[in-house]
Amino acid sequence: AIVFIKQPSSQDALQGRRALLRCEVEAPGPVHVYWLLDGAPVQDTERRFAQGSSLSFAAVDRLQDSGTFQCVARDDVTGEEARSANASFNIKWIEAGPVVLKHPASEAEIQPQTQVTLRCHIDGHPRPTYQWFRDGTPLSDGQSNHTVSSKERNLTLRPAGPEHSGLYSCCAHSAFGQACSSQNFTLSIADESFARVVLAPQDVVVARYEEAMFHCQFSAQPPPSLQWLFEDETPITNRSRPPHLRRATVFANGSLLLTQVRPRNAGIYRCIGQGQRGPPIILEATLHLAEIEDMPLFEPRVFTAGSEERVTCLPPKGLPEPSVWWEHAGVRLPTHGRVYQKGHELVLANIAESDAGVYTCHAANLAGQRRQDVNITVATVPSWLKKPQDSQLEEGKPGYLDCLTQATPKPTVVWYRNQMLISEDSRFEVFKNGTLRINSVEVYDGTWYRCMSSTPAGSIEAQARVQVLEKLKFTPPPQPQQCMEFDKEATVPCSATGREKPTIKWERADGSSLPEWVTDNAGTLHFARVTRDDAGNYTCIASNGPQGQIRAHVQLTVAVFITFKVEPERTTVYQGHTALLQCEAQGDPKPLIQWKGKDRILDPTKLGPRMHIFQNGSLVIHDVAPEDSGRYTCIAGNSCNIKHTEAPLYVVDKPVPEESEGPGSPPPYKMIQTHHHHHH
């Protein structure tokens, strides 16, 4: 048997990060392993691909990787297939979005003393926790004049006044990470003495030892003050610079210049504006050092002459976003022509054999350059080494038909039988070299076979006729165990075929002759009226000249067929009470009883505490609930036959008795008598 040494497990995963679903198999022979996602085969991509028997994810995607994964192992020789446990990802992600005005409908409608509601459009799983900022300062719930609704992601200012003016942003964090608003909202409720933002500093990315400039301007009457701070709250002025910011200059217009930037200069810079009245405005901007990661490897590609193909180059992660270009033989590809670059894609139009070779994708930004090669092969049409030949194959033995071809890349061979594609199963096997093996030749295998050898460049085909040398056999083989109904007429057929039409006769297995009421007519054993003595072992003998004789042994059982003594009745039960569905059957051999409830067999070993099937076949359901309503089928079966009977079960609410009704009032339904289970 195929055994899973390692099975995939359900697990947490982070959007865009690596993950691995493990699968490891032990089997007596070679097996091929593939993966299913929600029952459909998983195709390899550069992002998600088989790694040995396991499934590797270079970057988990919450849309493409949601669902149930299963590892399937198949032994192509025996046809045995085994499936692993199901596994799924709990994918954690967060996605930025803008701050938008929810109320009033437009900015023009914002007046002092009106209610203003802002909404943070950041989403994620698990649901993130939101934090609001005004001019970079966190707003906590319960502060005067505003309400933060974390569930609704809303910030409500009531009533809005000049002190609420400023740049509103939001951030959200979860187990996955954090994101801040991609677009912020400036609320302007005029008060001349309050500082207002004229120019806000922007995040900057620079290469090591380059310079960086942050601009910052506020306006107010009288003019506001402006101060710069770095990370640890150290003020930056032209007179007193902190030791790690010796090369910082603050200009009269509020701009901050940093020269010869080093890693220790990276971080958050705060620009603070203070008017005569109102709160200080704190604006933040981050200085990032440029960086670039390595690029993922390309799989080799196979293309056909004359076609158009594209190869996508995923740029490596980097700050700033790296630019991408393609080169071939050391020359950068143009943006038009037959072989050219379009966006991040390499495009090969009307491919020629001469286009084969190594193409290089380059990515670069301020931090440096990365490159990755892709090997492109141009496919050729297959040619013959050995065509299939007309063949005589013996029934019941393996048969082989050759189909040997060569090409670049290695050709794929498929076989057709009577113009129908042969899918590999327990009888047919296509070897790596294209040879077809018929594991056990059958009479109807005598027909035309055609093999087709293909590469992406084209295909060739040839056909051959198979003649089957038929063996002497029963058609069909008589069932080794058969039942006859006591006191009724019965027939037991036996027929056979061979290279010559065989003679067929019946005899009792002990050699004794058949009784006079039993006749053997051209292979059909006929019992005029079955008696108990007719039970026993019989032998059917088929023979012809060239192939000798064959025998089939049949054990005949005499039985009394099943009838129901007690059948289940249509039953109505109050919710919480006990339902009893009775069923009793008789026959010989004594029948066994099974129940089917709501289209599934009730397994006595898995019924749970509420259901029980008694020895006599009756089904009891305690503490019935509305979902127990439905059709219940009693199935009685023995080694000779099977019968079933069904009845509906209705579960209803117990009616509340009206004032006028006494305790003895009859219920509105025909109820069965049950015991009530009390819940504590």
Epitope: A1, I2, V3, F4, I5, K6, Q7, S9, S10, Q11, R22, E24, E26, A27, P28, G29, A82, R83, A85, N86, A87, K606
Partner: antibody
Framework: QVQLQESGPGLVKPSETLSLTCTVS????????VYWVRQPPGKGPEWLGV???????NYNPSLKSRLTISKDNSKNQVSLKLSSVTAADTAVYYC??????????????WGQGTLVTVSS | EIVMTQSPDFQSVTPKEKVTITCRAS??????LHWYQQKPDQSPKLLIK???QSISGVPSRFSGSGSGSDFTLTINSLEAEDAATYYC?????????FGQGTKLEIK
């Protein structure tokens, strides 16, 4: 019916090799794999390794360097060899039939076990 | 490897009482968990397979439940013959690992 019987010396000296044989009946080693499991006195069972119908083996990573499992299908015998033993290898050793399914499997047929003591 | 943790380590119970033993796996193992009973000087005996499937010949008072990483063995009305040590086993991936065991004593 299915039976498994472990045999081998009850006493082994430290640094020597512990050798045990499991003789099976009621099933064929060409149809079912066999596990070895041990249980130190007063502790829970510990899975040692398995030999499959193909003759392939899997071992517990903690013992891989010291453990060898082999079999002789014709004699219906599976053998275990554990080298460089110490007192920590003192345990009751069981052989167990794999259930023939597609998974790690339930262990429903166990030998009666044989106690091996490591002592000088 | 998958680590299996049982609780409690020891329990002293009177006959007819309901007993619950829990088992936790270090990662999700779906329903690939089996329970065994072991009495002194005997081989372990299979009680429940695949988390909740009962075994022929095992009294119906033994039942199992759970899926993922948390599982429970329940003995509905304890009998004197149930004094033993109970183990859970990971049947999901190799190596098969056992819990440290729960010893059940009858008062």
């Amino acid at each position: 019916q299915v039976q498994l019987q472990e045999s081998g010396p009850g006493l082994v000296k430290p640094s020597e090799t512990l050798s045990l044989t499991c003789t099976v009946s009621g099933f064929s080693l060409t149809s079912y794999g066999v596990y070895w499991v041990r249980q130190p006195p007063g502790k829970g069972p510990e899975w040692l390794g398995v030999i499959w119908t193909s003759g392939n083996t899997n071992y517990n990573p903690s013992l891989k360097s010291r453990l060898t499992i082999s079999k002789d299908n014709s004699k219906n015998q599976v053998s275990l060899k554990l080298s460089s033993v110490t007192a920590a290898d003192t345990a009751v050793y069981y052989c167990v039939k794999h259930d023939g399914g597609n998974y790690v499997g339930v262990m429903n047929y166990w030998g009666q076990g044989t106690l091996v003591t490591v002592s000088s | 490897e998958i680590v299996m943790t049982q609780s409690p380590d020891f329990q002293s119970v009177t006959p007819k009482e309901k007993v619950t033993i829990t088992c936790r796996a270090s990662q999700s193992i779906s329903d690939y968990l089996h329970w065994y009973q072991q009495k002194p000087d005997q081989s372990p005996k299979l009680l429940i397979k695949y988390a909740s499937q009962s075994i022929s010949g095992v009294p119906s008072r033994f039942s199992g439940s759970g899926s993922g990483s948390d599982f429970t063995l329940t003995i509905n009305s304890l009998e004197a013959e149930d004094a033993a040590t109970y183990y859970c086993q990971n049947g999901h991936s190799f190596p098969p690992t056992f819990g440290q065991g729960t010893k059940l004593e009858i008062k």
